[in-house]
């Protein structure tokens, strides 16, 4: 039940999983000048039972020049995810009523890991998109994608998001930018996704979406 493809690529957006379904694999990749230790794992695997899920195996990198040094995993704050995860995320919340059993949290970084994480997702995984800094989103619906099994094949659903440059003024009919003032923000009928910490963004929808992007007045 591994997903055949990667989640959809949305120009100028990054995606992130809030948690990873059991069966997800994360490649043990090292940054340039480093390599996996000889007996090291090829990947970490999210495994678990009904009450607890965790990552099996540890990724360890050693200098390509050295023979015997092994580097231990050093837990740090939450890190970048597959395909350059955004800087827009806040730290994970502790386990609470919205946690998903059978899912692992983001694994802590290991020393000298590669800059990009490569995950192999499983059916049922949901990922969430945000526009990168300097781009805005126009909203029409949720900016999320799920890996589904349909007729024996896996596919990712299309997130309702596209990101446009901050300076671009093109908007869909009826769509307005969010205001700076706390009260009376105009509505953006084309559903949108988005954001980083403080700057505001909007986005347009791809014309290939399920419903016409010119309709956000939902009848």
């Amino acid at each position: 039940e591994l997903c055949d493809d990667d989640p959809p690529e949305i120009p100028h957006a990054t995606f992130k999983a809030m948690a990873y379904k059991e069966g997800t694999m994360l490649n043990c990749e090292c940054k340039r000048g480093f390599r996996r230790i000889k007996s090291g794992s090829l990947y970490m695997l999210c495994t678990g039972n009904s009450s607890h899920s965790s990552w099996d195996n540890q990724c360890q990198c050693t200098s390509s020049a050295t023979r015997n040094t092994t580097k231990q995993v050093t837990p740090q704050p939450e890190e970048q995810k597959e395909r350059k995860t955004t800087e827009m995320q806040s730290p994970m919340q502790p386990v609470d009523q919205a946690s998903l059993p059978g899912h692992c949290r983001e694994p802590p970084p290991w020393e000298n890991e590669a800059t990009e994480r490569i995950y192999h997702f499983v059916v049922g995984q949901m990922v969430y998109y945000q526009c990168v800094q300097g781009y805005r989103a126009l909203h029409r619906g949720p900016a999320e994608s799920v890996c589904k099994m349909t007729h024996g094949k896996t596919r990712w659903t299309q997130p309702q998001l596209i990101c446009t440059g901050e300076m671009e003024t093109s908007q869909f009919p009826g769509e307005e930018k969010p205001q700076a003032s706390p009260e009376g923000r105009p509505e953006s009928e084309t559903s949108c996704l988005v954001t980083t910490t403080d700057f505001q963004i909007q986005t347009e929808m791809a014309a290939t979406m399920e419903t016409s992007i010119f309709t956000t007045e939902y009848q």
């Epitope: 806040s90 919205a98 998109y129 909203h139 619906g141 205001q179 988005v194 939902y218």
Partner: antibody, heavy 119, light 106 residues
Framework: QVQLKESGPGLVAPSQSLSITCTVS????????VYWVRQPPGKGLEWLGV???????TYNSTLKSRLTISKDNSKSQVFLKVNSLQTDDTAMYYC?????????????WGQGTLVTVSA | KIVLSQSPAILSASPGEKVTMTCRAS?????MHWYQQKPGSSPKPWIQ???NLAFGVPSRFSGSGSGTSYSLTISRVEAEDAATYYC?????????FGSGTKLEMK
């Protein structure tokens, strides 16, 4: 700990406006969307609208002309305003946060605030 | 507009029974979320994206479905499961809730 709490007037006269504040903690409004949902007594859930993390909004088309959703990220507050109230606007009003960024699964809910529209 | 029709509206079951409630969409959608609500309480997140159980949801619950038909199944009903269950989608516009299935104990 993620928390949302609605505060409203309780009783509102017909034709007046309703303003409800949702005060949140444990997360940033600039990162997650907040939805508004209401439930008339003894009835089902009705989606009112959403304010996305960037501050733009999407509304239920049947109520759109009467609704305004806004927020103040710095105060961690989201606001719902409903104009021209009628008796059938009597309901429990909930704000809810998504599980992931601008997602669609409402993973955290406030306790709700009951609004009665009556003369 | 996507309409979600839940059936049955009321479901009576005895403890230990297996029950299934259905949510049908008027057009094909990609996934379904579910919530549980008990009288006097806020809705609780129950199932995400068709089949992922929320934290604290007993493993006797499961979700499945595709296209226009989705279901929530309880393998062995317990008294504490008595509640109203709502389906919800926004994989196609607009956001919609189902009308709910009320599960009662016999």
């Amino acid at each position: 700990q993620v928390q949302l709490k609605e505060s409203g007037p309780g009783l509102v006269a017909p034709s007046q406006s309703l303003s409800i504040t949702c005060t949140v903690s444990g997360f940033s409004l600039s990162t997650y969307s907040v939805y508004w949902v209401r439930q008339p007594p003894g009835k089902g859930l009705e989606w009112l609208g959403v304010i996305w993390s960037d501050g733009s909004t999407t509304y239920n088309s049947t109520l759109k002309s009467r609704l305004t959703i806004s927020k103040d990220n710095s105060k961690s507050q989201v606001f719902l305003k409903v104009n021209s109230l009628q008796t059938d606007d009597t309901a429990m009003y909930y704000c809810a946060r998504t599980y992931g960024y601008d997602g669609s699964w409402l993973a955290y809910w406030g306790q709700g605030t009951l609004v009665t529209v009556s003369a | 507009k996507i309409v979600l029709s839940q059936s049955p509206a009321i479901l009576s079951a005895s403890p230990g029974e297996k029950v299934t409630m259905t949510c049908r969409a008027s057009s094909s959608i990609s996934y379904m979320h579910w919530y549980q609500q008990k009288p006097g309480s806020s809705p609780k997140p129950w199932i995400q994206a068709t089949s992922n159980l929320a934290f604290g949801v007993p493993s006797r619950f499961s979700g499945s479905g595709s296209g226009t038909s989705y279901s929530l199944t309880i393998s062995r009903v317990e008294a504490e499961d008595a509640a109203t269950y709502y389906c919800q989608q926004w994989s196609s516009n607009p956001f919609t809730f189902g009308s709910g299935t009320k599960l009662e104990m016999k």
